[in-house]
């Protein structure tokens, strides 16, 4: 969490951002909130990116002002116009690119004063894994698949029954480049699994950590997946 304060001139206002991560090819949110103003026409929001000459986005007098927007963000940004009045300056970024990673500044001017806060934005690819029994294999085998990851993640298997066991000798993980030549499909196979056990396939890179669980008995097979973004620090 980054909390910034304004400095000279008018009074300072508190601006808060949260470090976040964007999933390549999908839409992302750069979070920023500020002390609200009662009059929309008095609020100016500027988004800037370190190393980029033009603005990322500007909102003033109740509407977008994109005359000085940098080419790399053209047609890809939007604020939540109806939420600006309540102090939400978050930016929606469409079709996140790898090159969108970097340090952003959320700069706010209101009738109360000025303020800004920086935000670290990471980009990559992350997706939910699914674990299934592989009946095509010649031994008791689980297959964990996740369609899109970048940078290349690590994959670790764990078991509820054999807690602390190292499954690296009985698993095999492969990474297959997707058609856009950036992200990769992750496939990990775990051999010699046993009935009445719960197995977890954990995929992690510096952006996200995802887990796919499967519980197998003779009367039920339960699957569960969850994904967590790493380093979501507020400023």
């Amino acid at each position: 969490l980054i909390i910034g304060f304004g400095i000279s001139g008018r009074h300072s206002i508190t601006v808060t951002t949260v470090a976040s991560a964007g999933n390549i090819g999908e839409d992302g949110i750069l979070s920023c909130t500020f002390e609200p103003d009662i009059k929309l026409s008095d609020i100016v929001i500027q988004w800037l990116k370190e190393g980029v000459l033009g603005l990322v986005h500007e909102f003033k007098e109740g509407k977008d002002e994109l005359s000085e927007q940098d080419e790399m963000f053209r047609g890809r940004t939007a604020v939540f116009a109806d939420q600006v009045i309540v102090g939400n300056a978050s930016l929606r970024l469409k079709n996140v690119q790898l090159t969108d990673a970097g340090t952003y500044k959320c700069y706010i001017i209101t009738s109360k004063g000025k303020g800004n806060a920086n935000l670290e934005y990471k980009t990559g690819a992350f997706s939910m894994p699914e674990v299934n029994v592989d009946y095509n294999a010649s031994s008791e085998t689980l297959r964990c698949e996740a369609p899109r990851w970048f940078p290349q993640p690590t994959v670790v298997w764990a078991s509820q029954v054999d807690q602390g066991a190292n499954f690296s000798e009985v698993s095999n993980t492969s990474f297959e480049l997707n058609s856009e030549n950036v992200t990769m499909k992750v496939v990990s196979v775990l051999y010699n699994v046993t009935i009445n056990n719960t197995y977890s396939c954990m995929i992690e890179n510096d952006i996200a950590k995802a887990t796919g669980d499967i519980k197998v008995t003779e009367s039920e097979i339960k699957r569960r997946s969850h994904l967590q973004l790493l380093n979501s620090k507020a400023s």
Epitope: Y135, S138, S139, V193, I195, E218, S219, E220, I221
Partner: antibody, heavy 119, light 108 residues
């Protein structure tokens, strides 16, 4: 406890069609591959077809390929076998069977339904 | 297709005696073998999977052994309720999943 109950069997003329059903209970049907196995009178067991838990894959014995269609309705916990272009050699008791948790042995069987193909 | 061959076709045994049933695969199936028992007018019942693991509720007198191509089902002391037909089945390679022709265990 696991229960599989087949229905839909009967006498049918060669070349005609019949649809078998198998109602499942006592386990999470939507999570398991399901099979049909048949047994001609006085003969041994013959595997017929399997469908994956999510109906994304089906496999058939060569003897029924192109004539039989296995399907499932996970919202109804029911397995089906649509049998077309029936022949005298298809006369048998048809069992539905639940695949094992990790491999395809047959952990549970229904009581069977008799299909007789005769003119 | 993997062909499963059972022998003998019929086995005559007295109650209380030991019965040994054989099953051979046409190629290696590792331990991917199941044994089933079927009584007249009933559905088959799983006895053994993984060549040697007893299914739930199966008495200890039933045991399975073997791997690769040669497998054995042993009934240590035959009870009256054990007289039935026994089938082996491979699940190493499919389709198709294949059964042996069966061994009928009858009272001597």
């Amino acid at each position: 406890q696991v229960q599989l109950v087949e229905s839909g069997g009967g006498v049918v003329q060669p070349g005609r069609s019949l649809r078998l059903s198998c109602a499942a209970s006592g386990f999470t049907f939507r999570s398991f591959g399901m099979h049909w196995v048949r047994q001609a009178p006085g003969k041994g067991l013959e595997w017929v077809a399997v469908i994956s838990y999510d109906a994304s894959n089906e496999y058939y014995a060569d003897s029924v390929k192109g004539r039989f269609i296995i399907s499932r309705d996970n919202s109804k916990d029911t397995l089906y076998l649509q049998m077309n272009s029936l022949r005298a050699g298809d006369t048998a008791v048809y069992y539905c069977a639940k695949g094992g948790g990790l491999r395809w042995y047959f952990a549970y069987w229904g009581q069977g339904t008799l299909v007789t193909v005769s003119s | 297709e993997i062909v499963m061959t059972q022998s003998p076709a019929t086995l005559s045994v007295s109650p209380g005696e030991r019965a040994t049933l054989s099953c051979r695969a046409s190629q290696s199936i590792s331990s991917n073998l199941g044994w089933y028992q079927q009584k007249p007018g009933q559905a088959p019942r799983l006895l053994i999977y993984g060549a040697s693991t007893r299914a739930t509720g199966i008495p200890a007198r039933f045991s399975g052994s073997g791997s690769g191509t040669e497998f054995t089902l042993t009934i240590s002391s035959l009870q009256s309720e054990d007289f039935a037909v026994y089938y082996c089945q491979q699940y190493q390679s499919w389709p198709p999943l294949t059964f042996g022709g069966g061994t009928k265990v009858e009272i001597k």
